[in-house]
């Protein structure tokens, strides 16, 4: 090889050992029979050399540095050449470095031809091995602007006082052009400006200077986004840290053309703007840091650009001004992550503050819109608390558990609407009365409606799930001893059409000791399946539940248990079941931890089934499933 560097070229070539590898044989640079491991060639020098091994690319790297001095004379602006040409260089991983020094008052602009650049974070690498490392200067301090790959959106980077650009090319890469040019600009009065151009939909992840280390103190950095007017941009902060400020405040400022409130100032912890049409600027402003404990300011953010959907121009009013203790959350429904670019799906408050989820609280009227390609990617979860603190005031008071129509009119599917019903301890209990009798969901007779009510205890220490209930059954009412949550869960978009079938009234009633009482009025010829609460986990210790089963005068009820034995094993106490005729008070008592369960029995009058649990040993829980079937009395039952 012969490398000759012209005099006055201000180029230095350095061939040195790269990252040490576990290669058995060493390799040397050979110059007139001398074996060396580092070779430096300066301007005006000509050196002939060879390598002592077949694969020097595994051992050595080559650095070509060109110093460009814009302080003492005119700057060589325009397209930057790869000098010496790559064809004259040995086949090694190579890094071309351009170090441009300029006056503080002069702005320098790096312009990248297509493909534009994509910034990468620490620990990331470029798929083709071609990386661009760009740094600037503040007085004598070097500031890392970032490391970039090809195929991105960054088209220009403006700096002042100097710039250092390193282009790393792997030995096998055919690239023979720098891919950028340098132009002079007036002073930019800040650390740097990065221009990011979107031709169409896409995303860009960008970072503050020196990331993941701290942004220079009291500096200003700007990103200019060029976005076609027909597209919408949204900003989300992926990661940030704030330093300890002594004076001024760290902030981001947005300049949004057409906005009447420019610049719009946000704290880093605020929700950032979304649904912005066309171009905009984002600036990061540091502060004067505490000398003793400065901390670090750093920011990594994403800009997502996508088509506005029809929905983004529609405003929905959610009036919660007359509601109390209620919150509505619109959020992404869980999905498997796909690797391809998926446009963002945002919900926007007042059309501007967009995020992937949004919580609205009671007491206000909210205006929302959507920036989303497919609204089925979102769902709604609502929580409302109805509590009674004064038992004298609440007794016999009723509340309707109904999804407000404002919520039903939103273009997003309702997933859960949960009512938390709270009563004063040992003073009041609750009764749920459905508009349409309910069916309990069982494996034998599953619910196939578009929604169900999930009823569970709302006492933190109590793990008690009464079950899932849907319209179209025989359960007339459910009484519960203390605090519960009732969740209306939807299973199909057809809930919108079936919404009229929902309707549940809760009333506060005098306190009773049983955990729950189900009033069942079976319909003729239909088999009613009932099961103990906490199915699959077992009825909680020392819990008692009852079923009040009505039998019409002309009917007879057949009570059938689906197991021979309950399977419960008691650690302490006894588990028992009482079947009691309501008219005669005659009762049968079964020891559930000892006796076999009763064979199918016939009841001519209304009766009670009461099940009370012991403290079972783990793994031997109490789970019972039974059915009630009505038949006309005229049938010969023998």
């Amino acid at each position: 090889f012969e490398i000759a560097l012209p005099r006055e070229s201000n180029i230095t070539v350095l061939i040195k050992l790269g990252t040490p590898t576990l290669l058995a044989k060493p390799c040397y640079i050979v110059i007139s029979k001398r074996h060396i491991t580092m070779l430096s060639i300066k301007s005006g020098e000509r050196i002939v050399f060879t390598f002592s091994c077949q694969s020097p690319e595994n051992h050595f790297v080559i650095e070509i540095q060109k110093n460009i001095d814009c302080m003492s004379g005119p700057c060589p602006f325009g397209e930057v050449q790869l000098q010496p040409s790559t064809s004259l260089l040995p086949t090694l991983n190579r890094t071309f470095i351009w170090d441009v020094k300029a006056h503080k008052s002069i702005g320098l602009e790096l312009q990248f031809s297509i493909p534009r650049l994509r910034q990468i974070g620490p620990g990331e690498s470029c798929p083709d091995g071609v990386t661009h490392s760009i740094s600037g200067r503040i007085d004598a301090t070097v500031v890392r602007i970032g490391t970039f790959c090809s195929n991105g959106t960054v088209s220009r980077i403006k700096m002042q006082e100097g710039v250092k650009m390193a282009l790393h090319l792997p030995w096998f890469h055919p690239r023979n052009v720098s891919g950028f040019s340098i132009a002079n600009r007036s002073s930019i009065k800040r650390l740097c400006i990065i221009e990011s151009v979107f031709e169409g939909e896409g995303s860009a992840t960008l970072m503050s200077a020196n990331y993941p280390e701290g942004f220079p103190e009291d500096e200003l950095m700007t990103w200019q986004f060029v976005v076609p007017a027909h597209l919408r941009a949204s900003v989300s902060f992926l990661n940030f840290n704030l330093s300890n400020c002594e004076r001024k405040e760290e902030r981001v400022e947005y300049y949004i053309p057409g906005s009447t409130t420019n610049p719009e100032v946000f704290k880093l912890e605020d929700k950032q703007p979304g649904n912005m049409a066309g171009n905009f600027n984002l600036s990061l402003q540091g502060c004067d840091q505490d000398a003793q404990s400065p901390g670090i300011l750093r920011l990594q953010f994403q800009v997502l650009v996508q088509h506005p959907q029809n929905e983004s121009n529609k405003i929905y009013v959610v009036d919660l001004s007359n509601e109390r203790a209620m919150s509505l959350t619109i959020e992404p429904r869980p999905v498997k992550q796909s690797r391809k670019f998926v446009p963002g799906c945002f919900v926007c408050l007042e059309s501007r503050t967009c995020s992937s989820n949004l919580t609205l609280t009671s007491g206000s009227k909210h205006k929302i819109s959507f920036l989303c390609d497919d609204l089925t990617r979102l769902w709604m979860n609502v929580e409302k608390t109805i509590s009674c603190t004064d038992h004298r005031y609440c007794q016999r008071k009723s509340y309707s558990l109904q999804v407000p129509s404002d919520i039903l009119h939103l273009p997003v599917e309702l997933h859960d609407f949960s009512w938390k019903l709270l009563v004063p301890k040992d003073r009041l209990s609750l009764v749920l009365v459905p508009a349409q009798k309910l069916q309990q969901h069982t494996h034998e007779k599953p619910c196939n409606t578009s929604f169900s009510y999930l009823v569970a205890s709302a006492i933190p220490s109590q793990d008690l799930y009464f079950g899932s209930f849907c319209p179209g059954g025989s359960i007339k009412q459910i009484q519960v001893k203390q605090n519960i949550s009732v969740t209306l869960r939807t299973f199909a978009p057809s809930f919108q059409q079936e919404a009229s079938r929902q309707g549940l009234t809760v009333s506060f009633i005098p306190y009773f000791k049983e955990e729950g009482v189900f009033t069942v009025t079976p319909d003729t010829k239909s088999k009613v399946y009932l099961r103990t609460p906490n199915w699959d986990r077992g009825l909680p210790s020392l819990t008692s539940v009852s079923w009040n089963i009505s039998v019409p005068r002309d009917q007879v009820a057949c009570l059938t248990f689906f197991k021979e034995r309950s399977g419960v094993v008691c650690q302490t106490g006894r588990a028992f079941m009482i079947i009691q005729e309501q008219r005669t008070r005659a009762e049968e008592i079964f020891s559930l931890d000892e006796d076999v369960l009763p064979k199918p029995s016939f009841h001519h009058h209304s009766f009670w089934v009461n099940i009370s649990n012991c403290s079972p040993t783990s793994g031997k829980q109490l789970d019972l499933l039974f059915s009630v079937t009505l038949t006309p009395r005229t049938v010969d039952l023998t």
Epitope: F1, T50, F51, C53, Q54, S55, P56, E57, N58, P90, T91, L92, W171, F172
Partner: nanobody, 115 residues
């Protein structure tokens, strides 16, 4: 001096497969870094796949999952198995080898993907 000769190119329908070979002579390059480049008419030459002297491989994003680079050290030959070919894969494919700090290139073989 190393000579390289590519073969295996031709006309293939989209979705089809081809296997390119690159035979080296003049020197033993069985343990050297080898690379495939391609050049489409009127376009910049681009890197496709590389196999290092240690045998590790790397692919350009555009061919990842479809192309496989391999070598047969005994035969001093490198291969490029190309599956699920697309019209945009149409190009002259050239193989190169890094040998004592020089890269030697073959003349190329034409691959045309068209229905």
């Amino acid at each position: 001096e190393v000579q390289l000769v590519e073969s295996g190119g031709g006309l293939v329908q989209p979705g089809g497969s081809l296997r390119l070979s690159c035979a080296a002579s003049g020197s033993d390059v069985s343990a050297n870094g080898m690379v495939w480049h391609r050049q489409a008419p009127g376009k910049q030459r681009e890197w496709v796949a590389v196999i290092s002297s240690s045998g590790s491989t790397n692919y350009a994003d555009s061919v990842k999952g479809r192309f496989t680079i391999s070598r047969d050290s005994d035969k001093n030959t490198m291969y490029l198995q190309m599956n699920n070919l697309k019209p945009e894969d149409t190009a002259v494919y050239l193989c190169g080898v890094a040998h004592y700090g020089q890269t030697y290139w073959g003349k190329g073989t034409l691959v045309t993907v068209s229905s």
